[in-house]
């Protein structure tokens, strides 16, 4: 499996091939409005997505993508 | 060229109010949470406020709660810090700064100096 | 008194490693990332080190930040006298709702 592994403040991308045991490849996009934004990008052996985990707008919102294909992870979905 | 321009220090009575002005360009500036920090002479960095990119945000160190409103205009590309009743104690090199990444500033103005005296 | 706490000063021979520390607790470095700054004299700040350990565009790999716990660490290896300047360490305090630094250290190059 090929993902894109980076951290950027907004999208970013650079493809690597994974470890054997990384089935899925993650995104986690993390937006707090006093605090910046951050976009982790990685190989992960497991992967749950979530996609609004905070209640208050205060507190930021933070989402976790997950898929299973060649650089599937090199767009960013709101 | 991404830069942050500040403007309005000078020297000012305890009491007295100052406006504090920066000039953002180079980049897409209703899309990032600003900032002020601030060193005074002698003294480390001090946050002194920020504001989310739509203004929805907006925090203040509690050293200056209550006396210094930070405000910005998108349409003018620009960030402002009204300060009230000021102190000696807020004698300083004032910086605006953007932040990208997360809890990180990845762009500093050169500074404005404010004395109070 | 600076919120996250960092030795005054350190120095270091050209070419030597230095390390500098910055010690927080538990609402700030101990939930948060850290970031590093470079202070050159006359100038404003340069971010370094982000999200504890990673280099920001355009920095020189002699940098390098690590953090466990409650601290960080700051290390530049192979120091060059260009290198001169305070550093300065932060983090988000989720107490203060907002972010601290520490009170910098000027590293001198022998």
């Known amino acids: 499996l090929r993902c894109h592994v980076c951290t950027s403040s907004s999208n970013c991308k650079h493809s690597v091939v994974c470890p054997a045991s990384s089935r899925f490849c993650k995104t986690t996009n993390t937006v707090e409005p006093l605090r910046g934004n951050l976009v982790k990008k990685d190989c992960a052996e497991s992967c749950t997505p979530s996609y609004t985990l905070q209640g208050q707008v205060s507190s930021g919102t933070s989402s976790t993508q997950c898929c299973q294909e060649d650089l599937c992870n090199e767009k960013l979905h709101n | 060229e991404v830069q942050l321009v500040e403007s309005g220090g000078g020297l000012v009575q305890p009491g007295r109010s100052l406006r504090l002005s920066c000039a953002a360009s180079?980049?897409?500036?209703?899309?990032?949470?600003m900032h002020w920090v601030r060193q005074a002479p002698g003294k480390g960095l001090e946050w002194v406020s920020g504001?989310?990119?739509?203004?929805?945000?907006?925090g203040y160190a509690d050293s200056v709660k209550g006396r210094f409103t930070i405000s910005r205009d998108n349409a003018k590309n620009s960030l402002y810090l009204q300060m009230n009743s000021l102190r000696a104690e807020d004698t300083a090199l004032y910086y605006c700064?953007?932040?990208?990444?997360?809890?990180?500033?990845?762009?500093w103005g050169q500074g404005t100096t404010v004395t109070v005296s | 008194q600076s919120v996250l706490t960092q030795p005054p000063s350190v120095s270091g021979a050209p070419r030597q490693t230095v390390t500098i520390s910055c010690s927080g607790s538990s609402s700030n470095i101990g939930q948060n990332s850290v970031t590093w700054y470079q202070r050159l004299p006359g100038e404003a700040p340069k971010l370094l080190i982000y999200?504890?350990?990673l280099l920001h565009s355009g920095v020189s790999d002699r940098f390098s930040g690590s953090k466990s716990g409650t601290s960080a660490s700051l290390a530049i290896s192979g120091l060059q006298s260009e290198d001169e300047a305070e550093y300065y360490c932060a983090s988000w305090d989720d107490s203060l709702k907002g972010p601290v630094f520490g009170g910098g250290t000027k590293l001198t190059v022998l």
């Open positions: 999200y504890d350990d």
């Open positions: 180079g980049f897409t500036f209703d899309d990032y949470a």
């Open positions: 700064a953007k932040t990208g990444i997360l809890d990180a500033f990845d762009i």
């Open positions: 504001i989310s990119w739509n203004s929805g945000s907006i």
